[in-house]
């Protein structure tokens, strides 16, 4: 029997969501992150796309570029340099992988209006930045990386050995940019622009995947990337760098490697300056429990980089991988050797340190059964970052200011009472000095932007609040959601609940749990979405529930690590445990249970389905791992160590999809991937199939050609669309 | 248009004390690193000094060591160097230049000739 | 300091003529490797800077080519106004050495 929607006759103006409304993007919010320029000043994109600059003191704005001079080389990025002389302008974007793209730069000349001719830059660019002052510029092009002192000069040649798939320069290659520095770029400007640094990867021995991209012509391109699989060779990574004012002088300066890394497998994690002679480099072990931060200075005498064993600070983990997703950054403070940094406390709870000398010296500057996510800023007298702290909600983030400059430090939640009911999840972008900061509140209500001053706190104005949004809400049925937690044998499970409009505790509803679940991820976030599930549960009166297990993310070491070395075991049992409690509240049908996920959710909701628990009737798995030997070495080493006999292959084997084929006969499954998923490879789901076809279970199945991992364009809406005919049959819902 | 203009040349007896200037112009000077380079007579080019672009670091031939100082004004966009000790063999067409990235020489002034002679 | 031997010292060619210059460096110089021509009377002007990269408003007869310690300065048919002395130039270790020139005139 399926709810009633219609109560009163208010209720009758109203509609539930449509699968239209969601394909068509009808209810996305917008957010303002101002383009800071100085302290008090910030760029932003107009909606009739004209570039302004404001001035927040003195309440003035102009157009400093014209949507006329935007379009006229179909530009669909800018950047200003820090002179304000020039502005490039970016076009002809071409996505590449995740981070990644090329595009053609034109630079455009402030003083004069005009576009500089003469020593154009070459297309199309693998990356291209300004320098911090002034407006020099560093580009990659062709894996090569080329320094311009003014945008009118010839460039100057830093690296020549740069060869596609082979020997990248300045720009990461695919498992550094997906796995390790989350950037399209691997080159840094010193804070003055006098120095240049960047990373050397050199894939020549890195095994290569090989896929079709079927495209319209008579036979199918083969797209070749250099990808480390778990336990496979590695790319070779060496961090160089170069002066600016003088590149030929001595030419590029490798920085020296710590002994106690170089002693074996390794990688670079990040680079950050600290002063115009001063940097600061992050290493880890192949075996992610270990790194190293490194503080290196430049000796004029020898005009080489110095990286002394006493500016060495190791962290290292005993219960799991060193960080939480990636190893944190240090923040340097004033005195440009001291610095903050996030790392797990005594009691395995991720927390703000002070370091001054060692890592053991450390001073704890936030602490309790809580975590630090993020440090935006430091200034002279002040500390600013975000935590779950408050109400003890793990899914909820508040951005704090602690005053460094007073002693005892105090500190002030900014974001705690603003909007308490709206704005339950901030984040920060902050002006020079931090003498004005933007919040972005992702909800649970209306996203909302807002400006403020960064002495007093005190907000200034709305930089964007999603009328329009709210508008188009206000006859529209959402689902209600709730974000709860379940006690379990000593485990807390966060769990939010996605309620169909006229919820009745006393009827049954089917339910779909929607897992992701990787390690160090978290889905239960108190933010504002209208999505797929939003219509299911609006429209469909499914329930939805999406539950944070054991391996997730900012509750602790102990939840975290759970997972380590065993990926494929907890992660499911506690989706299971879920079902289970949810099932005792008594307005879930248990004979209409279903779960589904994508990526990682993908592998779970694939292990979950094969439990042989008989709690799911049916599941999707889209574009899912189905075993961890086919999955990046950076990722997949980091939770689950080598896939060696003296290692951990006994789980890597024992952890697969493919094992559990028997076990899918007594369920629905329904198996999507793109086949050019350059990230989670189509082999991870042909091996699936054909692991299904052998034991002659039978399955669903859907691919998309050429589409990579994320499914977007039109693949998007006849995805949702198949899942949708996919779960209402499942449910036994009418079309 | 970019534009070195040399001035301060001429005939100076051996010891003597001379100071070239050279006026740039078209270009953002305080960005560059700026140089000398002279020609003897019927002879090949030979690089004398260059300067970085705050000023704060030089270089010298050996040949002029100790003898020759180059500075710069960049509120004036102007390159100097002072050229004390004289001898015979410093004759030359003197050439202010510009050294870009401290490689190549992209913009040349038209030469002032010194002449050392008794 | 890094020497820079240029060869040959002079040559004659007729117009259309394709001439090849050489400058060979003491030690490696990587692609620091610069060629400039000088008519008489005027100051030099940069071609070929990075051993292969035309300089702006070049014409595209001239190239250059090599990288470590061989070079060539090559004109691929020589015009009327080309007659000239050309000189290569090394841009190392912030010591720049010229080499003696090569004297190209008309046969």
């Known amino acids: 029997l399926r709810p009633s929607r219609v109560h009163n006759s208010e209720e009758n103006t109203m509609r539930a969501l449509t699968l239209k409304d969601i394909l068509n993007g009808t209810f996305s919010y917008k957010t303002f992150f101002p383009n800071w320029i100085s302290g008090q000043e910030y760029l932003h994109q107009s909606a009739d796309n004209n570039i302004v600059l404001y001035n927040i003191e003195t309440g003035q704005s102009y157009t400093i570029l014209s949507n006329r001079t935007m379009k006229s080389v179909n530009a669909s990025n800018y950047g200003l340099s820090p002179d304000r002389q020039f502005v490039y302008l970016e076009s002809d974007y071409s996505k590449l992988w995740r981070y990644s793209y090329t595009a053609t730069y034109y630079i455009y000349d402030l003083s004069n209006g005009e576009f500089v001719r003469g020593n154009e830059l070459p297309r199309p660019i693998q990356y291209l930045c300004w320098s911090p002052v002034g407006s020099k510029l560093a580009y990659v092009y062709q894996n090569n990386i080329y320094l311009k002192q003014r945008p009118g000069d010839p460039p100057f040649q830093i690296t020549f050995n740069g060869r596609e798939n082979k020997i990248f320069n300045g720009i990461p290659d695919w498992v550094y940019e997906e796995e390790m520095l989350a950037t399209k770029y691997a080159l840094w400007w010193s804070p003055n622009g006098k120095f240049l640094a960047y990373a050397e990867f050199n894939d020549t021995d890195i095994p290569v995947i090989a896929y079709s991209y079927y495209g319209d012509e008579q036979y199918p391109r083969t797209i070749n990337i250099p990808y480390p699989k778990a336990g496979a060779k590695n790319p070779v990574v060496r961090i160089f760098i170069i002066d600016t004012t003088y590149p030929a002088y001595v030419g590029p300066q490798e920085v020296p490697v710590p002994a106690m890394i170089a002693s074996s497998d390794y990688y670079f994690s990040w680079l950050t300056w600290v002063t115009d002679e001063r940097v600061c480099l992050q290493w880890l072990k192949r075996v992610q429990n270990v790194s190293v931060l490194s503080i290196c200075d430049f000796r004029e005498d020898w005009q080489t980089w110095d990286c002394p064993k006493t500016q060495e600070h190791i962290e290292e983990s005993r219960t799991g991988w060193a960080g939480g997703f990636f190893v944190s950054t240090p923040v340097f403070s004033y005195d440009a050797i001291s610095y903050y940094k996030i790392f797990s406390d005594k009691d395995g709870y991720k927390h703000i340190h002070y370091i001054k000398d060692t890592v053991e010296n450390a001073i704890q500057i936030t602490s309790g059964k809580w975590e630090a996510i993020n440090i935006f800023r430091v200034t002279q007298d002040s500390l600013f970052y975000s935590s779950n702290e408050f109400e003890e909600y793990p899914g909820r983030r508040n951005i704090y200011r602690i005053s460094i400059g007073s002693y005892p430090p105090s500190k002030k939640c900014v974001t705690c009472h603003l909007r308490k009911e709206r704005c339950q999840y901030y984040t920060a972008s902050f002006s020079d000095y931090a003498k004005y900061y933007a919040l972005v509140c992702y909800g649970p209500g209306i996203p909302i932007s807002t400006l403020h001053d960064g002495r007093t706190d005190q907000e200034i104005k709305i930089l964007e609040e999603n009328k329009e949004l709210e508008n188009a809400l206000k006859n529209i049925q959402l689902p209600k959601e709730e974000i709860k937690k379940l006690e379990v044998d000593e485990i807390t499970l966060w769990y939010k609940m996605i309620l169909p409009p006229q919820f009745d505790r006393s009827k049954k509803y089917p339910l779909l749990i929607q897992v992701y679940g990787g390690p160090c991820s978290q889905s239960v976030r108190s933010v504002f979405a209208v999505n797929w599930i939003s219509y299911l549960a609006s429209k469909e009166g499914m329930v939805i529930a999406l539950v944070d297990g054991r391996g997730t993310a900012f509750q602790g070491d102990k939840l975290l690590y759970a997972v380590y070395r065993k990926l494929g075991v907890y992660e499911v049992e506690d989706q299971i445990t879920a079902v289970r409690k949810f099932i005792e509240m008594g307005f879930i049908d248990e004979k209409r249970i279903a779960i589904w996920g994508w990526s990682y959710g993908g592998y779970v909701s694939s292990l979950a389905l094969a439990s042989g628990t008989g709690l799911f009737k049916c599941g999707i798995a889209v574009a899912p791992v189905s075993s961890w030997e086919y999955y990046a070495s950076v990722y997949t080493e980091r939770f689950m160590g080598l896939p060696t006999k003296d290692d951990n292959l006994e789980h890597y084997k024992n952890s697969t999809v493919m094992a559990r084929a028997e076990y899918f006969r007594n369920v629905d499954y329904l198996l999507i991937h793109g086949t050019a998923d350059d990230n989670v490879h189509f082999q991870n789901s042909a091996q699936i199939a054909k692991a299904l076809v052998n034991a002659q279970v039978d399955f669903q199945a859907m691919w998309y050609s050429d589409q990579n991992h994320g499914l977007s364009g039109l693949s998007t809406n006849h995805l949702y669309t198949h899942m949708t005919h996919f779960l209402k049959q499942c449910f036994s819902l009418s079309d | 248009e970019v534009q070195l203009v040399e001035s301060g040349g001429g005939l100076v007896q051996p010891g003597g004390s001379l100071r070239l200037s050279c006026a740039a112009s078209?270009?953002?000077?305080?960005?560059?690193?700026m140089s000398w380079v002279r020609q003897a007579p019927g002879k090949g080019l030979e690089w004398v000094s260059w300067?970085?672009?705050?000023?704060?670091?030089?270089g010298y031939a050996d040949s002029v060591k100790g003898r020759f100082t180059i500075s710069r004004d960049n509120s004036k966009n102007t390159l100097y160097l002072q050229m004390n000790s004289l001898r015979a063999e410093d004759t030359a067409v003197y050439y202010c230049?510009?050294?870009?990235?401290?490689?190549?020489?992209?913009?040349w002034g038209q030469g002032t000739l010194v002449t050392v002679s008794s | 300091d890094i020497q820079m031997t240029q060869s040959p010292s002079s040559l004659s060619a007729s117009v259309g003529d394709r001439v090849t210059i050489t400058c060979r460096a003491s030690?490696?110089?990587?692609?620091?490797l610069n060629w400039y021509q000088q008519k008489p009377g005027k100051a030099p002007k940069l071609l070929i800077y990075?051993?292969?990269s035309l300089q702006s408003g070049v014409p595209s007869r001239f190239s250059g080519s090599g990288s470590g310690t061989d070079f060539t300065l090559t004109i691929s048919s020589l015009q009327p106004e080309d007659f000239a002395t050309y000189y290569c130039?090394?841009?190392?270790?912030?010591?720049?050495?010229f080499g003696q020139g090569t004297k190209v005139e008309i046969k």
């Open positions: 030690q490696s110089i990587s692609s620091y």
């Open positions: 230049a510009r050294l870009q990235y401290g490689t190549w020489f992209d913009y």
């Open positions: 300067i970085g672009p705050e000023g704060s670091r030089t």
């Open positions: 078209g270009f953002t000077f305080r960005g560059y690193i």
């Open positions: 990075a051993a292969s």
């Open positions: 130039q090394q841009g190392r270790l912030l010591l720049p050495t």
